[in-house]
Interface confidence: medium
Amino acid sequence: EEELQVIQPDKSVLVAAGETATLRCTATSLIPVGPIQWFRGAGPGRELIYNQKEGHFPRVTTVSDLTKRNNMDFSIRIGNITPADAGTYYCVKFRKGSPDDVEFKSGAGTELSVRAKPSAPVVSGPAARATPQHTVSFTCESHGFSPRDITLKWFKNGNELSDFQTNVDPVGESVSYSIHSTAKVVLTREDVHSQVICEVAHVTLQGDPLRGTANLSETIRVPPTLEVTQQPVRAENQVNVTCQVRKFYPQRLQLTWLENGNVSRTETASTVTENKDGTYNWMSWLLVNVSAHRDDVKLTCQVEHDGQPAVSKSHDLKVSAHPKEQGSNTAAENTGSNERNIY
């Protein structure tokens, strides 16, 4: 009679993570008598996967009833596959012996490859805000995918970015992989509404890439421009001076009026107007009683924006001359309307 052969017909099997893998194995003879075992890997370091004789195998089931006398099908199913299950599986026939069974013949092996989806990309930006014209770095991470081949792209408002560096780890063979990418983005004043997108494409995603996003509103700081203007006389001895704070982001802003260097009033921006580009405008008024001053008055509008060093703009109010409309010129645009007549 021809000697028993162990046949593993599938050289390789590809399974998606979470699914069930079927590893096929048949013997060509019932002789010699002895159990079948399945191992992952070969040699002394192999891992026992299934033992016909004894053991507890919660994820492994046999395809046919191994207790039947004439059974020659030793195929198994492994449930809830993870990338850690990848490897070459050998179906091994043992010959009954005393005291120990003896390995008799092994199948050629079936390589189990596991396809695992990458995790949703997580995009993170710099810890501190930056101003327009500065370059900031964004990172994108995704984990747990297999096989190793993966494509990552960066976009800003739908436009693909080119200044980025990507690494896939580990470099060698592994059950699953991670990707880490860093992109450099130059900020502009119009970026309050902008978005940076990291897009990951992998064979497991069937052409529907995963995306992670970061809003540049979390990253950008647009410093304000200031303009101080003297308004027409409201009463014989009163002059209205306005400080227009334009195009700033985020909203956190504190304004202080100084008269000849002395603090007159401090207020926090509350009722702001929003520009189309997402920046804000705000206006503060100061009513000055010129009869209380003998000499010319230097009025300063000092603004502290988002915890940054204060910026200021001054206006000289001539007391000797009859108050006329005067002002300092800076580009005016889309004024706000927080009108507070406080002296």
């Epitope: 891992e47 996967i49 033992n51 016909q52 004894e54 492994v60 850690a84 120990d100 069974d101 003896v102």
Partner: nanobody
Framework: QVQLQESGGGWVQPGGSLRLSCEAS????????MGWFRQAPGKEREFVAG????????YYADSMKGRFTISRDNAKNLVYLQMNSLKSEDTAVYYC?????????????????WGQGTQVTVSS
Amino acid sequence: QVQLQESGGGWVQPGGSLRLSCEASGRTSSSLDMGWFRQAPGKEREFVAGISRTGISAYYADSMKGRFTISRDNAKNLVYLQMNSLKSEDTAVYYCAAALTFRGSDLPRDSNYWGQGTQVTVSS
């Protein structure tokens, strides 16, 4: 080289439960079959339970089947032995073992690495 440290032993009444833990350091335990042996006073060391490196297969000595459960957490390099319905004859020093050695299809007979052991006493 692998270092193994057992914990969780102690005194328990018959019918009670204990959970033993074994922490592996040195070589990654996820590349090794691991298990538990025990040695009662005046007796030889005997196999209790074993688990393959990924946890896909486990094996138990007959007298422990249904009462003991072995499991592992490769991320933490830990192996556990949950012991329920304990009997006085389970009193022994329990040893964690790594790189179990098999012969044929029998249960593990030996190991390449051993812990110091943790005492389990079952008495009323």
